[in-house]
Interface confidence: low
C-alpha cells in the first residue's frame, strides 16, 4: 500500500506526460490527480511507465471508481488492462465493440488470459447474445473461441452470427458443440444454392442428422473423407450403400483406408455384404447374404 504523503512543491502534475516516468511511486500517488488521470488515460500508453508505476496509477483509478471504471476510461486503458484482475473486470459494463477490440489488441498474440475471458464474458452477457460483429471480432483474435464455449453458452449464438465462422474456428469443437451449432448453420445458409451451401455447411456437419445427410447425397456434393469421418456415427448408420456412394462421389474409394475406424467400421457392420460388394472396394464385415436382420438399432454411447 502506498502511504499518503504531501506532493512536493512544484511537482503537482498538470497533465499526464513523460515527465511522470521520473516520479517515485509515492510521488505519483501524491501528485497525480485521479480525475486528471481518468480524462487523459489515452496518454498513458505512450509513456513507458514501469509495472510498479502502473500499479500506482491503477490504485488511483480504483479509488476514484470503486464500483468499476466507466467505459470512457476502459476504452483507453491500453497496457494498464494487463494489470486488471478478473474481479476488477467483473465490475465493468462494456457495451462498445470498439472498447472490446482495443483491449483485445493489448493481449494480441498471447493465449486467452483470465482477464480477457472475463472481459468477453461481461461483454457478451451485456449484449445478451453473441451477435455477428462480436463473434467476428472474437474469432479474429482467438480462432478457438467458439469451441471454448459450453453447449449451453453456444445456444445464445444467433443463426446470423454463423456467417462469421471460419472452418478453422471449429477445429477443436466436440460433437456436443456441433450438435448446437449445426441447426443454426442450416438456418443461416438455407437460401444458398447447392454447391455454395455445401461449402458453407461442411464444417458444421459433425452435428447433422441422418435425414440431412440423405438430402445431401442427392446433391452431388462429393464430400471428402475427412468430413465424413467427423460425422455423427448415429447419423451415418442408417445411410444405405447407394446414399454413401452418392454422398462421397469420387471420394468413396477412401472408405477402404478407413474401414477399421468409426463411423465407417460401424456403418459397414450394418450393410448387406452384397451391397458393399457393389462398391468394388473389398470392404468386408457386412451382413452375409441370406441373413435376416431383425434389429438394426445400435445404442451409441457418445459423450
Amino acid at each position: 500500500e502506498v502511504e499518503k504523503t504531501a506532493c512536493p512543491s512544484g511537482k503537482k502534475a498538470r497533465e499526464i506526460d513523460e515527465s511522470l516516468i521520473f516520479y517515485k511511486k509515492w510521488e505519483l500517488e501524491a501528485c497525480v490527480d485521479a480525475a486528471l488521470l481518468a480524462t487523459q488515460m489515452d496518454r498513458v500508453n505512450a509513456i513507458p511507465f514501469t509495472y510498479e508505476q502502473l500499479d500506482v496509477l491503477k490504485h488511483k483509478l480504483d479509488e476514484l471508481y470503486p464500483q468499476g471504471y466507466p467505459e470512457s476510461v476502459i476504452q483507453h486503458l491500453g497496457y494498464l488492462f494487463l494489470k486488471m484482475s478478473p474481479e476488477d473486470i467483473r465490475k465493468w459494463n462494456v457495451t462498445s465493440l470498439e472498447t472490446l477490440k482495443a483491449l483485445l489488441e493489448v493481449n494480441k498474440g498471447h493465449e486467452m488470459s483470465p482477464q480477457v475471458a472475463t472481459l468477453i464474458d461481461r461483454f457478451v452477457k451485456g449484449r445478451g447474445q453473441l451477435d455477428k460483429d462480436t463473434l467476428d471480432t472474437l474469432t479474429a483474435f482467438y480462432p478457438g473461441y467458439l469451441c471454448s464455449l459450453s453447449p449451453e453458452e453456444l445456444s445464445s449464438v444467433p443463426p446470423s452470427s454463423i456467417w462469421a465462422v471460419r472452418p478453422q474456428d471449429l477445429d477443436t469443437c466436440d460433437p456436443r458443440q456441433l450438435d448446437v451449432l449445426y441447426p443454426k448453420a442450416r438456418l443461416a445458409f438455407q437460401n444458398m444454392n447447392g454447391s455454395e451451401y455445401f461449402v458453407k455447411i461442411q464444417s458444421f456437419l459433425g452435428g447433422a442428422p441422418t435425414e440431412d445427410l440423405k438430402a445431401l447425397s442427392q446433391q452431388n456434393v462429393s464430400m471428402d473423407l475427412a468430413t465424413f469421418m467427423k460425422l455423427r456415427t448415429d447419423a451415418v448408420l442408417p445411410l444405405t450403400v447407394a446414399e454413401v456412394q452418392k454422398l462421397l462421389g469420387p471420394h468413396v474409394e477412401g472408405l477402404k483406408a478407413e474401414e477399421r475406424h468409426r463411423p465407417v467400421r460401424d456403418w459397414i457392420l450394418r450393410q448387406r455384404q452384397d451391397d458393399l460388394d457393389t462398391l468394388g472396394l473389398g470392404l468386408q464385415g457386412g451382413i452375409p447374404n441370406g441373413y435376416l436382420v431383425l434389429d438394426l438399432s445400435m445404442q451409441e454411447a457418445l459423450s
Epitope: P114, A301, S303
Partner: antibody, heavy 117, light 110 residues
Framework: EVQLVESGGGLVKPGGSLRLSCAAS????????MNWVRQAPGKCLEWVSS????????HYADSVKGRFTISRDNAKNSLNLQMNSLRAEDTAVYYC??????????WGQGTLVTVSS | QSALTQPASVSGSPGQSITISCTGS?????????VSWYQQHPGKAPKLMIS???NRPSGVSDRFSGSKSGNTASLTISGLQAEDEADYYC??????????FGCGTKLTVL
C-alpha cells in the same frame, strides 16, 4: 513455461479428510480442462477426477465418487481436490495434469497422501 | 471401468525396435481415437509421448510412434536407446466421459 505444483499431501488416519491443491502457471489456466491422477506406491496410474475449463463438466472414478470433490478457481489459477472419508487404499502420489485434446500434456511432480492408523 | 491391458514387461537391445500393446474395449480404445501414451522414469511424473493414437507432441523423438487396430492400441519405439528404459502407460478416454489407464509396461534396454 507451464508449471503445475501440487500441495496438501500428508499423513491422515482412515476416515479423515485432506484437501489437495494444484497451483498452475505459465498458461491460460481458465482455457483448459484439468485432471487428478493417482499412483499407489509401485502400482498403476489411476484416473481420479476431471473438471472442464468452466467447471461445467465434472467426472469422478467410481472408487472415489461421493467421497472426493474436485473444484477450481480460475481467478487464482488453482485446482483443488477435497478428499473425505479416506481409506487405506487411497494412499498414493496424487498428480494434477492438464488436458490438451486427447492427452494429459503437463503433469505436476505429485504430492504423497498416506492413509494409515 | 476396467484398466486397459498391457504386458507387464518388454525388453530389447539398443538399436532394436519394440512394440507395447494396450487392449481395451469398444467403450474406450475401440470407441475413440483418444488413446495416449506416457513415459515414466522412477520417481518422476509421467510424460506425454503420444496423443490421439499417433500424434507426437513437439519435443518427443520421432522414434516413438503409435497406432490402433480395433480395441488394441500400440506404441512402437524404434532405435532403442538406454534412456528409453522406463515404465510406459497407455490411456484412453471412455464413453462415460472418464479416463482409463493401463497398468504399465516396464521397458528394459538390455
Amino acid at each position: 513455461e507451464v508449471q503445475l505444483v501440487e500441495s496438501g499431501g500428508g499423513l491422515v488416519k482412515p476416515g479423515g479428510s485432506l484437501r489437495l491443491s494444484c497451483a498452475a502457471s505459465g498458461f491460460t489456466f481458465s482455457s483448459y480442462s484439468m485432471n487428478w491422477v493417482r499412483q499407489a506406491p509401485g502400482k498403476c496410474l489411476e484416473w481420479v477426477s476431471s473438471i472442464s475449463s468452466r467447471s461445467s463438466y465434472i467426472h469422478y472414478a467410481d472408487s472415489v465418487k461421493g467421497r472426493f470433490t474436485i473444484s477450481r478457481d480460475n481467478a487464482k489459477n488453482s485446482l483443488n481436490l477435497q478428499m473425505n472419508s479416506l481409506r487405506a487404499e487411497d494412499t498414493a502420489v496424487y498428480y494434477c495434469a492438464r488436458v490438451q485434446r486427447a492427452g494429459l500434456d503437463y503433469w505436476g511432480q505429485g504430492t504423497l497422501v498416506t492413509v494409515s492408523s | 471401468q476396467s484398466a486397459l491391458t498391457q504386458p507387464a514387461s518388454v525388453s530389447g537391445s539398443p538399436g532394436q525396435s519394440i512394440t507395447i500393446s494396450c487392449t481395451g474395449s469398444s467403450s474406450d480404445v475401440g470407441n475413440y481415437n483418444l488413446v495416449s501414451w506416457y513415459q515414466q522414469h522412477p520417481g518422476k511424473a509421467p510424460k506425454l509421448m503420444i496423443s490421439e493414437v499417433s500424434n507426437r507432441p513437439s519435443g518427443v523423438s520421432d522414434r516413438f510412434s503409435g497406432s490402433k487396430s480395433g480395441n488394441t492400441a500400440s506404441l512402437t519405439i524404434s532405435g532403442l536407446q538406454a534412456e528409453d528404459e522406463a515404465d510406459y502407460y497407455c490411456s484412453s478416454y471412455t464413453s462415460s466421459s472418464t479416463w482409463v489407464f493401463g497398468c504399465g509396461t516396464k521397458l528394459t534396454v538390455l
